[in-house]
């Protein structure tokens, strides 16, 4: 079953995807579509990279990750609940039935009513993230810095939110891990 | 307008530590796309990319140089910097910083107007 | 790493001339080919990328062409601001790398 990945109305969402290439030059074409995997290409594709270049994309969708090292994980903006489905990475491997699919669930929630921001702060700047990705990411850490991927803006909800959001199991499930501190 | 500014010390003693930075102004530099470069110009000679750091700070080395190179960033202040160790008279050029677009990767469009730096005891 | 050879080092010609710069891989780049202008004390500029392709504000006296190993930089009627060094860089294979130069000189 697919990996079920959340984001709220008006948030940015983050799709995880990666895969090994053999240099930074030399890279695998990728889509991603909204809908299942299909026998070949993408449905619905909303962006697409070839051996060098990040050729198709659409108005709200980019990659967060450097796609030169193999992150290919999908950033859509400013989600609406429309937004939510399912999103097929497909990594195109040379060769007959090669591919490499991967089926993502998003689901998009209301966007929660907050108080007035009176400590407020951005979770990120106070707790930068370290994820590192493993297995068929690429072998390095990354520090993202303050970036928009995962949601969290709130050091008051972060307990709430790596509970409710199973933020840990799906990056843990993507093949990677989070370090807050 | 996308306008980038390199900046540091234009004299370096052989055996110490390079170090630039470049400003990037009139752009989206927090922003997935685009890949913020070091490429470098003896004088007299042609250009050598150094390498490379995407908004995420992931980076890329020339391999000629990779066991001397740090590229780093700090958005806050839409800055990016090259550390070369061990500098001998040959790092002596002019260092460019430039920009790359993942839709066009390896090209680059836009570009500082350079700093020299001379490796000198 | 390919190695781009730039041919001739240094081209005398007057305004008005057709200028005609090569660029020569030491193994197929396809099309990823770059073309840079330089004047003195400046940045390059982007003149012409993926071989043929114009960038955004490049006049259209300027044209690339050639695919695999030859590449050929041409300027149909020069203008006194178009003498600078040209450089072509090729994104084919990792790292990228430039060549040598073409300095234009006023004959």
């Known amino acids: 079953s697919e990996v079920e990945y959340r984001a709220e109305v008006g948030q940015n969402a983050y799709l995880p995807c990666f895969y090994t290439p053999a240099a930074p030059g030399n890279l695998v074409p990728v889509c991603w579509g909204k809908g299942f995997c299909p026998w070949s290409q993408c449905t619905n594709e909303v962006l697409r990279t070839d051996e060098r270049d990040v050729n198709y994309w659409t108005s709200r969708y980019w990659l967060n990750g450097d796609f030169r090292k193999g992150d290919v994980s999908l950033t859509i903006e400013n989600v609406t609940l429309a937004d939510s489905g399912i999103y097929c990475c497909r990594i195109q491997i040379p060769g007959i039935m090669n591919d490499e699919k991967f089926n993502l669930k998003l689901v998009i929630k209301p966007a929660k009513v907050t108080p007035a921001p009176t400590r407020q702060r951005d979770f990120t700047a106070a707790f930068p993230r370290m994820l590192t990705t493993r297995g068929h990411g690429p072998a390095e850490t990354q520090t993202l810095g303050s970036l928009p991927d995962i949601n969290l803006t709130q050091i008051s909800t972060l307990a709430n939110e790596l509970r409710d959001s199973r933020l840990a199991n799906d990056l843990r499930d993507s093949g990677a891990t989070i370090r807050i501190g | 307008q996308v306008q980038l500014q390199e900046s540091g010390p234009g004299l370096v003693k052989p055996s110490e530590t390079l170090s630039l930075t470049c400003t990037v102004s009139?752009?989206?530099?927090?922003?997935?796309?685009?890949?913020w470069n070091w490429i470098r110009q003896p004088p007299g000679k042609g250009l050598e990319w150094i390498g490379y750091?995407?908004?995420?700070?992931?980076?890329n080395y020339n391999p000629s140089l990779k066991s001397r190179v740090t590229i780093s960033l700090d958005t806050s202040k839409n800055q990016f910097s090259l550390k070369l160790s061990s500098v001998t008279a040959a790092d002596t050029a002019v260092y460019y910083c430039?920009?790359?677009?993942?839709?066009?990767?390896?090209?680059?469009?836009?570009w500082g107007q350079g700093t020299l730096v001379t490796v000198s005891s | 790493e390919i190695v781009l050879t730039q041919s001739p080092a240094t081209l005398s010609l007057s305004p008005g001339e057709r200028a005609t710069l090569s660029c020569r891989a030491s193994?197929?780049?396809?099309?990823?080919l770059a073309w840079y202008q330089q004047k003195p004390g400046q940045a390059p500029r982007l003149l012409i990328y993926?071989?043929?392709n114009r960038a955004t504000g490049i006049p259209a006296r300027f044209s690339g062409s050639g695919s695999g190993t030859d590449f050929t930089l041409t300027i149909s009627s020069l203008e006194p601001e178009d003498f600078a060094v040209y450089y072509c860089?090729?994104?084919?294979?990792?790292?990228?790398?430039f060549g040598q130069g073409t300095k234009l000189e006023i004959k």
């Open positions: 193994q197929s780049v396809s099309s990823y």
């Open positions: 860089q090729q994104r084919s294979n990792w790292p990228p790398t």
């Open positions: 009139g752009g989206s530099f927090s922003r997935g796309g685009y890949y």
């Open positions: 430039a920009r790359d677009h993942y839709s066009s990767s390896w090209t680059f469009d836009y």
């Open positions: 993926d071989a043929s």
């Open positions: 750091i995407y908004y995420s700070g992931s980076t």
